[in-house]
Amino acid sequence: PPNRRTCVFFEAPGVRGSTKTLGELLDTGTELPRAIRCLYSRCCFGIWNLTQDRAQVEMQGCRDSDEPGCESLHCDPSPRAHPSPGSTLFTCSCGTDFCNANYSHLPPPGSPGTPGSQGPQAAPGESIWMAL
């Protein structure tokens, strides 16, 4: 039977707004990723900032509702915004426990002024786990 959806929770210092209220934080100790049990959806999200082929996690947590993309089993990020020249924000939504912890690859940002190469790439069949 399904459990309430549980996602990795992370918010980079200085990030505006918080999604902490969209779930209940689990007491996981210090050495494990922080986990949040979603209150209003069965969907996790992740946001990464890609700058010069280096990806940094910005936010991870629960979505406020189930919407397109939430049926995905894995985090497959797509480019969303350009917060500054040379950097691109990638976001993913997915609907399995802790699916927002990692991404298998970042697609090419594919827009003017941004390198068209793939972001940090995992070896075939592997995933990159974000170090939180």
């Epitope: 039977p1 459990n3 309430r4 689990l26 959806s41 069965r42 426990d97 802790f98």
Partner: antibody, heavy 113, light 112 residues
């Protein structure tokens, strides 16, 4: 087919600890929570806690917090539960379950002086 | 903690006849994600519990269609359309909506 095979019965004295195992097969161990439930003699069922094998994140019934440790060995697809500071009312059958759909055969733990 | 109250606690039934077990929770079991984490288990004598129903009304694989679950909010029912000898045992409702997850006290079904 999905199987959860638990370790054998244990007899312990009050104040001791017990660590039991639950070996999973027939599915991808890291994709499902492993829950632990106990059943005291002639009593109902009581949820102890759960662990997600992929990353070790666990969630507990407050009643057992501080006395229970849940761990996994991904290389052998085995989950473990340790219960410390045993009391006579911890005498029970302890079950592991794969996210509550498939259950192990149970481990009878008897706490007696 | 959420209290799960089952009735009746003992249920003598004639083979081939229907049976019904009620489960009431002290708080609503509908979660914010719209799902109701209510399950039913059967524990046959000397065996481990076995999942019958999850999400109020979804039969687990291999569970005969004579078992059905219904309800919402705080009131739930397990029905057996025609009781068979292998249905003897203790039936438990269980909620996974609120921490800690809790079980009902059990309903013992026996053949008259």
């Amino acid at each position: 087919q999905v199987q959860l095979v638990q370790s054998g019965a244990e007899v312990k004295v009050p104040g001791a600890s017990v660590k039991m195992s639950c070996k999973a097969s027939g599915y991808t161990f890291t994709d499902y929570w492993v829950s632990w439930v106990r059943q005291s003699p002639g009593q109902g069922l009581e949820w102890i806690g759960e662990i997600y094998p992929k990353n070790g994140v666990s969630n507990f019934n407050e009643k057992f917090k501080g006395r229970v440790t849940l761990t996994v060995d991904k290389s052998t697809s085995t989950a473990y539960m340790e219960l410390r500071s045993l009391r006579s009312d911890d005498t029970a059958v302890y079950y592991c379950t794969r996210q509550r759909d498939y259950w192990g055969q149970g481990v009878l733990v008897t706490v007696s002086s | 903690d959420v209290v799960m109250t089952q009735s009746p606690l003992s249920l003598p039934v004639t083979l081939g006849q229907p049976a019904s077990i009620s489960c009431r929770s002290s708080q609503s079991l509908e979660y914010g994600d719209g799902y109701t984490y209510l399950e039913w288990y059967l524990q046959r004598p000397g065996q481990s519990p076995r999942l019958l129903i999850y999400g109020v009304s979804n039969r687990f694989s291999g569970v005969p269609d004579r078992f059905s679950g219904s309800g919402s909010g705080t009131d739930f029912t397990l029905k057996i359309s025609r009781v068979e000898a292998e249905d003897v045992g203790v039936y438990y409702c269980f909620q996974a909506t609120h921490d800690p997850n809790t079980f009902g006290q059990g309903t013992k079904l026996e053949i008259k």
